[in-house]
Interface confidence: low
């Protein structure tokens, strides 16, 4: 009769370094000791008639265990194959390029050390959770590669490597190990240089905006911009909108930078650089400066207006070019009330690198005159019906504008510019006094108040007064015009003070 020796469990699978409880049993009616033959560390846990139980510890590799027992003068054996599975010790994705141009291929490379059984080990390369490649792990260490075409969508995408140890047929499940992810940075840098908008000319100690723009840049936010005026780096504010990057800075020219200079804009992305350069001329242009002998003068004062600019500039004073053409001009005048508020404008033109640069300065003359009180603006006689609404009007002229007061008997004021109901109290002669820092003038103003019963007489008197007044005024104006013409003729014979006297003062 043939007896059997059973070993349980049959062909077990366990994780590396694990322990295993093994039972050997036979139907042979022998009380012989059952032996376990293995190189593994073992310990007898218990035994009985026809059976023995062992504990195997620190099982690190695949192994075949054998149980044997003597039975009726012969030996019977039983065996079991232990399969040890182990997760890889190292799963690593090789570093990616620091920057990868969009549209070019790059290689993903994964190295796997350890892991068993190799027949059940697969290596998967991933972008996010998308499988790019699946290959068996063969050599030790195993290396798996995949070629990927870089796209804009890959920017910032995590790439990783995953190992799958499939122990599902053994009822143990799928063991997954994943490498640390590596983030890819992709970029697009157009071949075109940036657009540089900069001034062609820049005056010393002045500032001007400089703009540098590059379109079709991805990712625009990662680009580095260098803006400089000559060797002076400019503090740029960088903005990006979509695929467009704009760097704005303020260029301020220093005195030591005078002459031909270059404005440079460098845009660097992904280790590549695009550059734009623009020529710029830094120039110095002082003036023009307009000087009045005095900005505020009294009527009749002689005033000299001088204009001076950069030595190489050509100036024009009140539209009249300097004679000879040069950096200085002047004119002389005798101040009249009409000159109050008059502007004296000096324009200077300087040629810089074939381009004309213009500058202006304007000064205003203040002429002090007056005060004045005349019939036109302050009539000497008013006749008003009693109880009518009237507004006494009297305007004093002068610079500064005089203060005006009209008093009857030194106390009773005439309400100038206010609407009043005419009463008998209003009648009388008022002394109007216009006063300013330039002096004072007085004028008598008579107010007549008409009682209602004299209306017809009054109308006649007023009509006669108007006719006589008109005739008188016409005579006065005619004589005044004659006197003015005569005065101008005399002045012309002496030499006109108003004529611009432009001259170039020697340097």
């Amino acid at each position: 009769q043939e007896f059997l020796l059973r070993v349980e469990p049959q062909n077990p699978v366990l994780s590396a370094g694990g322990s295993l409880f093994v039972n050997c049993s036979t139907d042979c009616p022998s009380s012989e000791k059952i032996a376990l033959e293995t190189s593994l560390s073992k310990e007898l846990v218990a035994s009985g008639m026809g059976w023995a139980a062992f504990n195997l510890s620190n099982v690190t590799g695949n192994s075949r265990i054998l149980c044997s027992v003597y039975c009726n003068g012969s030996q019977i054996t039983g065996s079991s194959n232990i399969t040890v599975y182990g997760l890889p010790e190292r799963v690593e994705l090789a570093p990616l390029p620091p920057w990868q141009p969009v549209g070019q291929n790059f290689t993903l490379r994964c190295q796997v050390e350890g892991g068993s059984p190799r027949t059940s080990l697969t290596v998967v390369l991933l972008r996010w959770e998308e499988e790019l490649s699946r290959q068996p792990a063969v050599e030790e260490p195993a290396e798996v590669t995949a070629t990927v075409l870089a796209s804009r969508d890959d920017h910032g995408a995590p790439f990783s490597c995953r190992t799958e140890l499939d122990m599902q047929p053994q009822g143990l499940g799928l063991f997954v190990n994943t490498s640390a992810p590596r983030q890819l940075r992709t970029f697009v840098l157009p071949v075109t240089p940036p657009r540089l908008v900069a001034p062609r000319f820049l005056e010393v100690e002045t500032s001007w905006p400089v703009d540098c723009t590059l379109d079709g840049l991805f990712p625009a936010s990662e680009a580095q911009v260098y803006l400089a005026l000559g060797d002076q780096m400019l503090n740029a504010t960088v903005m990006n909108h979509g695929d467009t990057l704009t760097a704005t800075a303020t260029a301020t020219a220093r005195a030591d930078q005078e002459g031909a200079r270059e404005i440079v804009c460098n845009v660097t992305l992904g280790g590549e650089r695009r550059e734009a350069r623009e020529n710029l001329t830094v120039f110095s242009f002082l003036g023009p400066i307009v000087n009045l002998t005095k900005p505020e003068v009294s009527e009749g004062t002689e005033v000299t207006v001088k204009c001076e600019a950069h030595p190489r500039a050509k100036v024009t004073l009140n539209g009249v070019p300097a004679q000879p053409l040069g950096p200085r001009a002047q004119l002389l005048l005798k101040a009249t009330p009409e000159d109050n508020g008059r502007s004296f404008s000096c324009s200077a033109t300087l040629e810089v690198a074939g381009q004309l640069i213009h500058k202006n300065q304007t000064r205003e003359l203040r002429v002090l005159y007056g005060p004045r009180l005349d019939e036109r603006d302050c009539p000497g006689n008013w006749t008003w019906p009693e109880n009518s609404q009237q507004t006494p009007m009297c305007q004093a002229w002068g610079n500064p504008l005089p203060e005006l007061k009209c008093l009857k008997d030194g106390t009773f004021p005439l309400p100038i510019g206010e609407s009043v109901t005419v009463t008998r109290d209003l009648e009388g002669t008022y002394l109007c006094r216009a006063r300013s820092t330039q002096g004072e003038v007085t004028r008598k103003v008579t107010v007549n108040v008409l009682s209602p019963r004299y209306e017809i007489v009054i109308i006649t008197v007023v009509a006669a007064a108007v006719i006589m007044g008109t005739a008188g005024l016409s005579t006065y104006l005619y004589n005044r015009q004659r006197k003015i013409k005569k005065y101008r003729l005399q002045q012309a014979q002496k030499g006109t003070p108003m004529k611009p006297n432009t001259q170039a003062t020697p340097p």
Epitope: N235, T237, T250
Partner: antibody, heavy 119, light 106 residues
């Protein structure tokens, strides 16, 4: 060194407007955003808005959208804030403060302009 | 808008004591800033990007936190630390400040 010099105290009637200034020195004015902050007596800080002096772009706290107007003059490196239709609720100290970037926050502050609204 | 809630509103501490004040955001923020203000003075930057001390701030101060919960700690209180401390965020418009924690000397 960086300095923000604000204009002096203001006393205004209800319904009137005030315009205060903040003169910057010691750095390139156009580079940094200028913020304005309100602090009522014994109260906390309240953000009004900011201006980018380089582009004159402004962004306001909605609460101050119709109250404050922020402007900047590049030539004098000065930021301005005008407060309109004043009420007693606008009586406060107003600060200008430079935003130095994420690594610094509001790194430089003016000494404050006190506004008192009273009839 | 993101509301920052500071607690406590008022606290007092003796010299040598450890002090902790908190700042809670109504929604998650990446980082916050802290400012110190003393009476009749402008606020001063104190802590930036949650945990970095501004120039001239004593090392006894520290900041920590993430998400919606942040704190400022003084390891050993000193008399000069008595002030009001404000937290601030600018994850979204409007920029907001906490109502402040007033720290008094006991």
């Amino acid at each position: 060194q960086v300095q923000l010099q604000q204009s002096g105290a203001e006393l205004a009637d209800p319904g009137a407007s005030v315009k205060m200034s903040c003169k910057a020195s010691g750095y390139t004015f156009t580079v940094y955003w200028m913020h304005w902050v309100k602090q009522r007596p014994g109260q906390g800080l309240e953000w009004i808005g900011y201006i980018n002096p380089n582009t004159d772009y402004t962004e306001y706290n909605q609460r101050f959208q119709d109250k404050a107007t922020l402007t900047a003059d590049k030539s004098s490196s000065t930021a301005y804030m005008q407060l309109s239709s004043l009420t007693s609720e606008d009586s406060a100290v107003y600060y200008c403060a430079r935003w130095g970037g994420n690594s610094y926050g509001l790194d430089y502050w003016g000494q404050g302009t006190s506004v008192t609204v009273s009839s | 808008q993101i509301v920052l809630t500071q607690s406590p509103a008022l606290m007092s501490a003796s010299p040598g004591e450890k002090v902790t004040m908190t700042c809670s955001a109504s929604s998650s923020v990446s980082y916050i800033y802290w400012y110190q203000q003393k009476p009749r003075s402008s606020p001063k930057p104190w802590i930036y990007l949650t945990s970095n001390l501004a120039s001239g701030v004593p090392a006894r101060f520290s900041g920590s936190g993430s998400g919606a919960s942040y704190s400022l700690t003084i390891s050993i209180m000193e008399a000069e630390d008595a002030a009001t401390y404000y937290c601030q965020q600018w994850k979204s418009i409007p920029l907001t400040f906490g109502a402040g924690t007033k720290l008094e000397l006991k």
